[in-house]
């Protein structure tokens, strides 16, 4: 279809003002999913920078899908006249930040982080490995970015950018990824292999982000982390295609080439990694 063949031109900072996304899923393309229902839904279009209508098939898809235009605007637009900034000039936290810590019904002893609304801080807890709720982050940094207030009355957002309380502008934060490349795959691809806590010796693969290859390791059968794949192909599909070469401060170079969508499950949402 046309999406597969479209030409991706280089977009640099000078061509468009930087897009200030409130949530990373607002950047996802509208996805009608594989089912055949005809349901009117709304998505945020990063090109027009507006919420628009689309037809949803009724299953799967992604998080850039809203029941109403108002809900879409609330989640994805930064309309200064009708900001979601509280009177304290802080960006509103997602609802799930206020959910209590939930280890879930399984017991895998996995270290995760949650936002404690009593202490107003992100804290460590032991996650069981299944179910639970969305107040559950792989890293302390991710939890702080999404749920904690910054030191100067700003809310840190998902893109490693801060909403400045004074002029309502976005200030980019430093990233640990080398400047030549930007990683757009799942965050767990950057974590080290983790054998886990049990005593089995299962053959698994992990993505070694230093050498950029999938390597075998022995998995204990429980615990560990998400950089854990049953086959090398699965590992490569999920992680290898996540690096995009940067060519300028804000532009990504993308080659004109047929690409297929590869669905990757990440924590509580589905993201799409484009095969380069």
């Amino acid at each position: 279809d046309s999406e597969e063949d479209e030409e991706h031109t280089i977009i640099t900072d000078t061509e468009l003002p930087p897009l200030k996304l409130m949530h990373s899923f607002c950047a996802f393309k509208a996805d009608d999913g594989p089912c055949k229902a005809i349901m009117k839904r709304f998505f945020f279009n990063i090109f027009t920078r507006q919420c628009e209508e689309f037809i949803y098939g009724g299953c799967e898809g992604n998080q850039n899908r809203f029941e109403s235009l108002e809900e879409c605007k609330k989640m994805c637009t930064r309309d200064n006249a009708n900001r979601i900034i509280k009177t304290t000039l802080q960006q509103e936290k997602p609802d799930f930040c206020f959910l209590e810590e939930d280890p879930g019904i399984c017991r895998g002893y996995i270290t995760r982080y949650f936002y404690n609304n009593q202490t107003k801080q992100c804290e460590r807890f032991k996650y069981g490995g299944c179910l639970g709720n969305m107040n559950n982050f792989e890293t302390l940094e991710e939890c702080k970015n999404i749920c904690e207030d910054g030191p100067n009355g700003f809310q840190v957002d998902n893109y490693g950018t801060q909403l400045n309380a004074v002029n309502n502008s976005l200030t980019p934060q430093s990233t640990k990824v080398p400047s030549l490349f930007e990683f757009h795959g799942p965050s767990w691809c950057l974590t080290p292999a983790d054998r886990g806590l049990c005593r089995a010796n299962e053959n698994r693969f992990y993505y070694n982000s230093v050498i950029g290859k999938c390597r075998p390791f022995k998995y204990s059968g429980c615990g560990g982390n998400e950089n854990n794949f049953t086959s090398k192909q699965e590992c490569l599909r999920a992680c290898k295609k996540g690096f995009i070469q940067r060519i300028s401060k804000g532009g990504l170079i993308k080659t004109k080439r047929k690409r297929k969508k590869q669905r990757v499950k990440i924590a509580y949402e589905e993201i799409f990694v484009k095969n380069m």
Epitope: D102, P103, I105, C106, R107, G108, G129, G224, R263, K265
Partner: antibody, heavy 123, light 112 residues
Framework: QVQLQQSGPGLVKPSQTLSLTCAIS??????????WSWIRQSPGRGLEWLGI?????????RYAVSVKSRITINPDTSKNQFSLQLNSVTPEDTAVYYC?????????????WGQGTLVTVSS | DIVMTQSPLSLPVTPGEPASISCRSS???????????LNWYLQKPGQSPQLLIY???NRASGVPDRFSGSGSGTDFTLKISRVEAEDVGVYYC?????????FGQGTKVEIK
């Protein structure tokens, strides 16, 4: 060997409260390696999960949205049992009700079930 | 809710022959740590369900090795290598990827 023994009335009138109890032997309702659930089965709906409780650092519960406004699952640690209360029942709630243990450690699944109680909602 | 769809709904089998049941989920169940959040249960006539396969492919204790589970993503299969008379009943798949926990509608296995 874990055993779950269900008890409670088999007939409930519409608008009344359905109450069932599940007595546990061979495990503890407060165990941090288990969770305790109610599931019902009817010809129209098949197996339908209703809710679950579990003790970790504290007690947690989760309920199916379809019954959330009407359901309560409570542990009774003194009697080592847990109960189901479903308020404002209608004939749609007629089903065989099962209590089940979710194995939280290695075997993540409902590995032990009660014998089932047929509850009929009728005046 | 995640919808679990099984096929076939009825499966007449011959003892000693293999049998296969399919289960499809409306969204991917393979998530963290290489774990598949899918179980299989068998409900024999007049009995409560019993756990057969957990985490997609692991046999529960006491389950004969003629039962095997496989699959990933949204497509899963339960196989019986050689059906025995005691295997008759209704087989259910169940997901625990997200609340509410949901079951397939069941596949009734009966002897021809």
């Amino acid at each position: 060997q874990v055993q779950l023994q269900q008890s409670g009335p088999g007939l409930v009138k519409p608008s009344q409260t359905l109450s069932l109890t599940c007595a546990i032997s061979g495990d503890s309702v407060s165990s941090n390696s288990a969770a305790w659930s109610w599931i019902r089965q009817s010809p129209g709906r098949g197996l339908e999960w209703l809710g679950i409780i579990y003790k970790r650092s504290k007690w947690y519960n989760r309920y199916a949205v379809s019954v959330k406004s009407r359901i309560t699952i409570n542990p009774d640690t003194s009697k080592n049992q847990f109960s189901l209360q479903l308020n404002s029942v209608t004939p749609e709630d007629t089903a065989v009700y099962y209590c089940a243990r979710w194995h939280s450690d290695k075997m993540w699944g409902f590995d032990d079930w009660g014998q089932g109680t047929l509850v009929t909602v009728s005046s | 809710d995640i919808v679990m769809t099984q096929s076939p709904l009825s499966l007449p089998v011959t003892p000693g022959e293999p049998a296969s049941i399919s289960c499809r989920s409306s969204q991917s169940l393979v998530m963290s740590f290489g774990i598949t959040y899918l179980n299989w249960y068998l409900q024999k006539p007049g009995q409560s369900p019993q756990l057969l396969i957990y985490k997609g492919s692991n046999r529960a204790s006491g389950v004969p090795d003629r039962f095997s589970g496989s699959g990933s993503g949204t497509d899963f299969t339960l196989k019986i290598s050689r059906v025995e008379a005691e295997d008759v009943g209704v087989y259910y798949c169940q997901q625990y990827d997200s609340y509410p926990l949901t079951f397939g509608q069941g596949t009734k296995v009966e002897i021809k």
